[in-house]
């Protein structure tokens, strides 16, 4: 028998520095977690103690904090090289800055192979990107070799900016021939490493003949055997065992997100490459694990540029940006309009001639808007200003919901109106009229939504049975502020870009902004 230790991360999302327990900015260092310096300590400890170790990343290193905004992926290559990752799969967020924003900082600089079997380049890009990412890699480990096949969510064109010269194929269809090639090469230990979410990970384990282990990402799935060490609630045991169509037991793993845990899986193979046993658990990277001093020093060196960036002007406002709770928790506020407009703008993807865009709607809890921005400071808007408006380090995500769920959400928005509660929704691509004289749960009297399958966008009444795409904060997607119906009834959820980054990019693009209160939210006569 031959034993392999797989160390894995996924959805790190730019958390190079240690974070608080909820993966936001570290405040009390003695209680902070994660970060590449701490990760390195643990990885090195395991490498010294065990003979056959692979360190793998399942994608979405890009996007999530000011580190990515400033360094644009150079930080990912630099610190992953320093940690000596063995391989990485491409995630959807790796395309956030377009293909060039992937090629130059990461694909050309990474010292480890970057993988995806289901992304095919065409046209002029084919020769430019040739060899910079691969469908599979044969990694020598000790006296054996291990095959790694990569995959990426085929929804990436709707979630990021891969352009028109990359084709995202069905994962299972694309993986099978690559696994077959590895088998032909007499590589009999094969890991599928990828970024399509836990449901697809399980399908790959079930359907792709020859895959022995699946290491996934995208869905931020936390798996654990035993008593979990922090706040995350396990979606299942670690590893999660799938019985393949040909009768094999295939371990599937994921390690939550944000570098909070290091996935740790031990696999025992027989001489024919069959999995005899698999066990492990994610390791919580808490403050009991010291940060490696040399990596920490490097982080501090790179940090300097971030501090300078946060005070630079992004753009100007010529109007007061009303982000006060007195406005945003009671009525339409122009800060809410600005943020929603930025959220839609960030999701412009012309992937189908029938649609002007794939999504037109935004909802945003008024309680998530934490500060106004005064235009009387020469109109200057900085990252620092935006961090006061959106201090929680969330993301603006894409969900699919039925009209009936949206209706429930808008009823919830005003179910206890007048108490300055955070659930009052700011909107984009939506016209809502409330009648507060009616009883809670029956206050939405008009709800019109902007069409997507149209050449001239216009507002049509919401259809209860229709499925709509909506951009919203991850806080709402996870049922925050009492929006349990969103969490319970959503049909799809893909995590998006860092909230501040979305708004800052929009302001930089627009240069001068002047959002208005324009009648997106109305109250029918006699009730307000």
């Amino acid at each position: 028998a031959w034993e392999l230790t797989i160390l894995h991360t996924n959805d790190v999302h730019s958390r190079l520095e240690q974070t608080s327990e909820d993966s936001s900015k570290c405040v009390n260092a003695s209680r902070c977690m994660g970060g590449v310096a701490r990760l390195f300590t643990k990885v090195q400890q395991i490498r010294r103690a065990e003979p056959n170790v692979l360190l793998l990343d399942a994608g979405d290193q890009y996007q999530g904090t000011i580190w990515f905004t400033v360094y644009k992926g150079a930080e990912v290559a630099h610190f992953m090289n320093a940690l000596r990752y063995d391989a990485m799969a491409l995630g959807n967020h790796e395309f956030d800055n377009g293909v060039e924003g992937l090629i130059e900082p990461l694909l050309k600089e990474a010292k480890f192979p970057i993988l995806s079997a289901n992304i095919k380049a065409k046209g002029p890009l084919a020769s430019q990107i040739s060899g910079l990412y691969l469908p599979y890699k044969v990694l020598p480990v000790g006296d054996e070799v291990v095959g790694i096949v990569g995959y990426t969510s085929k929804e990436t064109p709707f979630l990021s900016n891969p352009g028109t010269n990359l084709v995202f194929e069905d994962e299972i269809t694309a993986l099978q021939p690559e696994v077959d090639k590895l088998k032909t090469l007499n590589v009999n230990k094969i890991i599928a490493l990828g970024h399509s979410g836990f449901e697809m990970d399980k399908l790959i384990a079930q359907k792709v003949r020859g895959v022995d282990v699946v290491v996934g990402g995208h869905s931020n799935t936390f798996l654990y055997t035993g008593n979990p060490p922090s706040k995350e609630v396990p979606a299942g045991k670690y590893p999660f065992i799938v019985t393949s169509d040909d009768g094999r037991k295939v371990p599937v793993v994921q390690a939550y997100a944000f570098g909070k845990y290091l996935g740790y899986l031990k696999i025992e193979f027989d001489e024919r490459g069959n999995v005899i046993s698999s066990h492990g658990n994610p390791i919580l990277l808490n403050s009991s694990i010291p940060e490696d001093p040399s990596i920490k020093a490097d982080i501090n060196k790179w940090r300097i540029k971030l501090d300078n960036y946060s005070t630079q002007e992004l753009g100007k406002t010529i109007v007061y940006l009303d982000g006060s709770s007195q406005s945003c928790r009671f009525r339409e506020c122009n800060m809410g309009n600005l943020i929603c407009d930025a959220m839609i703008n960030n999701n412009l993807r012309h992937t189908d001639e029938m649609f002007w865009n794939h999504v037109s709607m935004c909802i945003l809890n008024g309680g998530g808007i934490r500060s106004p921005i005064d235009e009387r400071n020469n109109g200057t808007i900085t990252w620092e200003n935006l961090a006061a408006v959106l201090p929680f380090g969330g993301t603006f995500d894409l969900v699919q919901l039925k009209g009936s769920t949206l209706k429930k959400a808008f009823e919830h928005s005003v179910h206890r109106y007048g108490q300055s509660t955070g659930e009052f929704l700011q909107v984009g691509g939506i016209h809502v009229v409330y009648d507060l004289s009616r009883k809670p749960g029956d206050r939405v009297v008009k709800l019109d939504v902007l069409c997507t399958k149209c050449r001239v966008p216009s507002y049509d009444p919401l259809k209860m049975d229709e499925v709509y795409k909506v951009i919203l904060p991850n806080f709402l997607a996870n049922g925050g502020d009492g929006f349990q119906m969103i969490k319970d009834e959503l049909l799809r959820h893909d995590s998006g870009d860092q909230d501040i980054n979305v708004v800052s990019t929009y302001i930089s693009k627009m240069k001068v902004i002047y959002p208005a209160v324009e009648g997106r939210i109305k109250f029918s006569t006699g009730s307000h």
Partner: antibody, heavy 119, light 107 residues
Framework: QVQLQQSGAEVKKPGASVKVSCKAS????????IYWVRQRPGQGLEWIGW????????KYNEKFKGRATLTADTSASTAYMELSSLTSEDTAVYYC????????????WGQGTLVTVSS | DIQLTQSPSFLSASVGDRVTITCKAS??????VAWYQQKPGKAPKLLIY???TRHTGVPSRFSGSGSGTEFTLTISSLQPEDFATYYC?????????FGQGTKVEIK
């Protein structure tokens, strides 16, 4: 573009050792295997072994095990092939090569290094 | 070790001819076969890998086929620059081995 530049011709006495270098450029050295192949005068091609500069693991043709040593210097993007206990049978052109996809054919070759073993 | 036997060892042909070279493996190698062209004093050049995939920049007149133990390299219309020695190689089992070569000469 991918280039592999090998060291110059060598003349060695029987029993001696030779070390041939192969400097890679135009790609990330640590991400691809370097293969070594030799061709004796007027003969066919013979695979010696490979090294993966990403973690310095090696694999040898049993015929060369114990005599050939493959190493790499990642800071210089250079691979080396050392062959010891030379005999006249080792007179050959030695090539380094790189693939496009792991193992699947040698796509890029060095220009070759002629090693002559003669007393 | 897996032996690869190429036939013919020598082949005389004219410009424009269709040329077929075969490579027989002593045991099955699935499709783990590559084909190379070598000219005197030069390093080999990869033509085909995975038995039938043309390497970037290789003219479409070169094609490969076969699986298991029998493989063929076909040049659909021989050009003056195609006169060279051709080698097959298997990378399915260690040690990786080459055929003895087929020299294509001008008739």
């Amino acid at each position: 573009q991918v280039q592999l530049q090998q060291s110059g011709a060598e003349v060695k006495k029987p029993g001696a050792s030779v070390k041939v270098s192969c400097k890679a450029s135009g790609y990330t050295f640590t991400r691809y295997y370097i293969y070594w192949v030799r061709q004796r005068p007027g003969q066919g091609l013979e695979w010696i072994g490979w090294i993966y500069p990403g973690n310095f693991n090696t694999k040898y043709n049993e015929k060369f095990k114990g005599r050939a040593t493959l190493t790499a210097d990642t800071s210089a993007s250079t691979a080396y092939m050392e062959l010891s206990s030379l005999t006249s049978e080792d007179t050959a052109v030695y090539y380094c090569a790189r693939d496009v996809y792991d193992y699947a054919g040698f796509a890029y070759w060095g220009q070759g290094t002629l090693v002559t073993v003669s007393s | 070790d897996i032996q690869l036997t190429q036939s013919p060892s020598f082949l005389s042909a004219s410009v424009g001819d269709r040329v077929t070279i075969t490579c027989k493996a002593s045991q099955g190698v699935a499709t783990a076969v590559a084909w190379y062209q070598q000219k005197p004093g030069k390093a080999p050049k990869l033509l085909i890998y995975w038995a039938s995939t043309r390497h970037t920049g290789v003219p479409s007149r070169f094609s490969g086929s076969g699986s298991g133990t029998e493989f063929t390299l076909t040049i659909s219309s021989l050009q003056p620059e195609d006169f060279a020695t051709y080698y097959c190689q298997q990378y399915s089992s260690y040690p990786w081995t080459f055929g003895q070569g087929t020299k294509v000469e001008i008739k």
